[in-house]
């Protein structure tokens, strides 16, 4: 089938992928790669987990869900047209020929250009407020879009929220691993 996941330039894209850990904390290695799943592994790896943690990821790619419960859905931050294409989520189940392979097609569309009559709208168009609920990122709620009633005193608060939510993700996923990119 040719099902497509969609996002606009500048948004975050969400590519869902799930598996059932055999027991809580008994994780299976997972890799995400750009390009269709090859026979083994993932090509052009953008993120990888091991039996304990996320052990490799490149800038803009992260897991926002509870990967310790098997939610290994990929978030791609601030997408560009170049992010369009097929992505492979590979659940690397131990044993011969046990891997589950998912090929997800991502289509990036140009951002809708809307008139920006006030400076407040300029800000919110540049910084759409992101949902930070862990593990929830369906397409229709990836961003809350412009917040027309925002006032200038809220701008620094919103900027801090954006920074802090990303930092929280970084801290949660990093463990003792090295940040790449």
């Amino acid at each position: 089938s040719e099902v497509e996941y969609r996002a606009e330039v500048g948004q975050n894209a969400y590519l869902p992928c799930f598996y059932t850990p055999a027991a809580p904390g008994n994780l299976v290695p997972v890799c995400w790669g750009k390009g269709a799943c090859p026979v083994f592994e993932c090509g052009n790896v953008v993120l990888r987990t091991d039996e304990r943690d996320v052990n490799y990821w490149t800038s803009r790619y992260w897991l926002n869900g509870d990967f310790r419960k098997g939610d290994v859905s990929l978030t791609i931050e601030n997408v560009t047209l170049a992010d369009s294409g097929i992505y492979c989520c590979r659940i690397q189940i131990p044993g011969i020929m046990n891997d589950e392979k998912f090929n997800l097609k991502l289509v990036i569309k140009p951002a809708k250009v809307t008139p920006a009559p006030t400076r407040q709208r300029d800000f919110t168009a540049a910084f759409p407020r992101m949902l930070t609920t862990r593990g929830h990122g369906p397409a229709e709620t990836q961003t809350l879009g412009s917040l027309p009633d925002i006032n200038l005193t809220q701008i620094s608060t919103l900027a801090n929220e954006l920074r802090d939510s990303r930092l929280a993700n970084d801290l949660r996923d990093s463990g003792a691993t090295i940040r790449i990119g």
């Epitope: 089938s1 099902v3 996941y5 969400y14 869902p16 992928c17 799930f18 059932t20 869900g65 509870d66 098997g70 939610d71 859905s73 044993g95 011969i96 020929m97 046990n98 589950e100 392979k101 998912f102 090929n103 997800l104 097609k105 593990g135 929830h136 990122g137 369906p138 397409a139 229709e140």
Partner: antibody
Framework: EVQLQQSGPELVKPGASVKMSCKAS????????MNWVKQSHGKSLEWIGR????????NNNQNFKGKATLTVDKSLNTAYMQLNSLTSEDSAVYYC????????????WGQGTLVTVSA | DIVMTQSHKFMSTSVGDRVSITCKAS??????VVWYQQKPGQSPKILIF???YRYTGVPDRFTGSGSGTEFTFTISSVQAEDLAVYYC?????????FGGGTKLEIR
């Protein structure tokens, strides 16, 4: 075009066993697990389990442990489900189903095999 | 096991009406929910996945939304051919489980 062709209806006696088949075509059989789903008359759907055509490995719903045995014949591109010690509770339509390439939802279904358990 | 609850077993509607069917999961299933349509005498057919994307070839009057534990399936303008049973299913955890189904009846 992906197709799943199931065997015909079965009328069986209580205590007996039945083995139904699901022949796959239109894709590489070993690339996807085959799933089995039960639907009792007028009722909802229950996932029974799945079998890996590459190596015969299975994941079963615990509710069907000892009831359903899932196997494959790679050379025939066919999956099988055997139901043992049948009772009236096992009277149902049984579907084989294959997931989509991009996620674990069932995009392809067989037409179903009706099993009737009656003395 | 995760229990998927569809609160209405039956819903009666008229052609052209908007109708929404809800599904609640007994625990957080993130976005791992899909919706199927089953017409009388037929196999189920996938309509919505992830849980707001229409499957290939599905008319745009069918939409879905939700995340976590609460999900909604909507038909914006019911047609006569929409007479069917609609099921939600979670694929977050094995065993994958289905809702009890909601039968849409056309008045």
């Amino acid at each position: 075009e992906v197709q799943l062709q199931q065997s015909g209806p079965e009328l069986v006696k209580p205590g007996a066993s039945v083995k139904m088949s699901c022949k796959a075509s239109g894709y590489t059989f070993t690339d996807y697990y085959m799933n089995w789903v039960k639907q009792s008359h007028g009722k909802s759907l229950e996932w029974i389990g799945r079998v890996n055509p590459s190596n015969g490995g299975t994941n079963n719903n615990q509710n069907f442990k000892g009831k359903a045995t899932l196997t494959v014949d790679k050379s025939l591109n066919t999956a099988y489900m055997q139901l043992n010690s049948l009772t009236s509770e096992d009277s149902a339509v049984y579907y084989c189903a294959r997931r989509d390439s991009s996620g674990y939802w069932f995009a392809y279904w067989g037409q179903g095999t009706l099993v009737t358990v009656s003395a | 096991d995760i229990v998927m609850t569809q609160s209405h077993k039956f819903m009666s509607t008229s052609v052209g009406d908007r109708v929404s069917i809800t599904c609640k999961a007994s625990q957080d299933v993130s976005t791992a929910v899909v919706w199927y349509q089953q017409k009388p005498g037929q196999s189920p057919k996938i309509l919505i996945f992830s849980p707001s994307y229409r499957y290939t070839g599905v008319p745009d009057r069918f939409t879905g939304s939700g995340s976590g534990t609460e999900f909604t399936f909507t038909i914006s303008s019911v047609q006569a051919e929409d007479l069917a049973v609609y099921y939600c299913q979670q694929h977050y955890n094995i065993p994958w489980t289905f809702g009890g189904g909601t039968k849409l009846e056309i008045r």
